[in-house]
Interface confidence: medium
């Protein structure tokens, strides 16, 4: 049997929401059993249609209608064959879409005007992905690489910390971090070392 | 001219059995599906499951999964809906669908181009 | 379970413009299907892939699909249109279909 899959290039390139239709012809068999295969397993859902063009040609399609980054990955058709298995040449579908946050900023609990860092990193594709930072509604730094390491010198107030993820798809906005004032018992030596620095807030270092 | 062709049912007691046959005529039985479909009287579609144009894979919906069973009979071109057991909230009419197409876009079971004209299968003790 | 939802009856004057929605979690992966059902007949598609019509339907049906909300629309409904309309689509994983419970449309 001829087996290849039709209509989508060895590599196929699709936007995150998009539909997707995979075509996969099989020539030299009467009822072939054609079967979707995604990274080694077969894809068992109702998504498939099979035309019969001709009695001895076929065409199966695997239909997505909105892609999102789960649905990436190498697709093939296969047909069994007189007991034996036969694959078609396999297509990688790449979806991309806007950043997507595998670290977010986390709340944390800091001394007055002890120096705290942030985390913040995001993937696509598409690459490159580059961050811009915001403290409240004021950006502090960026855009720089992901990931990113945001290295505050210290607050004396509860302060909310963001950071945005751009690549050529659009932006991505992470959850917002508080980070809060702890509280320093009195007489300690943090407190009386650091009572008198009401606007430490020194302009953060924005490195990767 | 595709054809659907319903068996008809009689009345039946709760805990009979029960099999219920779609005769296909007009195109190539194995080229399609066929999905079975319940309607209860006054009540609105219920999708029961489906049979793969081949007979090698079936689904079923959730409340169906363990109460019927589909089959079909490739040299009879006729899909089948059995119960071992019936129950009177099975009353209902039946109806068999032959799935997908050779027109562009549709997707298996979705696309339902042709409906039996169903079965009424009455369950009274 | 996964399940679609539709409002019972909705009622337009003729050359009106009827709207019935299906609502259901899965709609943003999965297509929406319009099935209409004559009094004592047997169901036929209206609507394929959320905005595709069948083959031989009226212009004035038309679907579309937003978020998870799926609508028929029948511009300019007619008498003939008087019927019940039920949405269909596939659950979450693929591996069963769901028929909403069904909207009767009159057109008074």
């Known amino acids: 049997a001829g087996l290849k899959l039709m209509g989508a290039p060895v590599k196929l390139t699709v936007s995150q929401g998009q539909p997707v239709k995979l075509n996969c012809s099989v020539e030299g068999m009467e009822e072939p059993d054609i079967q979707w295969v995604k990274d080694g397993a077969v894809v068992q859902n109702l998504d498939q249609l099979y035309i019969p063009v001709s009695e001895q040609h076929w065409i199966g399609f695997l239909s997505l209608k909105s892609v999102e980054r789960s649905d990436a990955g190498r697709y093939w058709c296969q047909v069994e064959d007189g007991g034996e298995t036969e694959i078609s040449q396999p297509v990688w579908l790449t979806v991309e879409g806007v950043p997507f946050f595998t670290v977010e900023p986390k709340d944390l609990a800091v001394p007055p005007n002890a120096p705290f860092q942030l985390s913040c990193e995001a993937v696509g594709p598409p690459e490159p992905v580059t961050i811009v930072w915001w403290r409240g509604t004021t950006k502090i730094g960026g855009p720089a690489p992901s990931p990113s390491v945001l290295n505050v010198t210290g607050v004396t107030q509860s302060t909310m910390f963001s950071c945005e993820a751009h690549n050529l798809k659009g932006l991505a906005s992470s959850r917002t971090a508080t980070v809060h004032l702890q509280l320093v018992p009195r007489g300690s030596s943090a407190h009386h070392h650091h009572h008198h620095h009401h606007s430490a807030w020194s302009h953060p270092q924005f490195e990767k | 001219e595709v054809q659907l062709v319903q068996s008809g049912a009689d009345v039946k007691k709760p805990g009979a059995s029960l099999t219920i046959s779609c005769q296909a005529s007009?195109?190539?039985?194995?080229?399609?599906?066929i999905s079975w479909v319940r309607q209860k009287p006054g009540k609105g579609l219920e999708w029961m499951g489906a049979?793969?144009?081949?007979?090698?894979?079936?689904y079923y919906g959730p409340s169906f999964q363990g109460h019927v069973t589909i089959s079909a009979d490739r040299s009879t071109a006729t899909a089948y809906l059995q119960w071992r057991s019936l129950e009177a909230s099975d009353t209902a009419m039946y109806y068999c669908?032959?799935?997908?197409?050779?027109?562009?876009?549709?997707?298996?079971?979705?696309?339902?181009?042709?409906w039996g004209p169903g079965t009424l299968v009455p369950v009274s003790s | 379970s996964y399940e679609l939802t539709q409002p019972p009856s909705v009622s337009v004057s003729p050359g009106q413009t009827a709207r019935i929605t299906c609502s259901g979690d899965?709609?943003?992966?999965?297509?929406a299907y319009w099935y209409q059902q004559k009094s004592g007949q047997a169901p036929v598609l209206v609507i394929y892939?959320?905005?595709k019509r069948v083959s031989g339907i009226p212009e004035r049906f038309s679907g579309s699909s937003s978020g998870t909300m799926a609508t028929l629309t029948i511009s300019g409904a007619q008498v003939e249109d008087e019927a019940d309309y039920y949405c269909?689509?596939?659950?979450?994983?693929?591996?069963?279909?769901?028929f909403g419970g069904g909207t009767k449309l009159t057109v008074l």
């Open positions: 669908v032959r799935s997908g197409g050779l027109t562009s876009g549709g997707t298996i079971p979705e696309y339902y181009q042709h």
């Open positions: 007009g195109y190539t039985f194995t080229d399609y599906w």
């Open positions: 049979i793969s144009r081949n007979g090698s894979t079936t």
């Open positions: 899965a709609l943003p992966k999965k297509y």
């Open positions: 892939e959320d905005k």
């Open positions: 269909y689509s596939l659950a979450v994983d693929g591996n069963y279909g769901v």
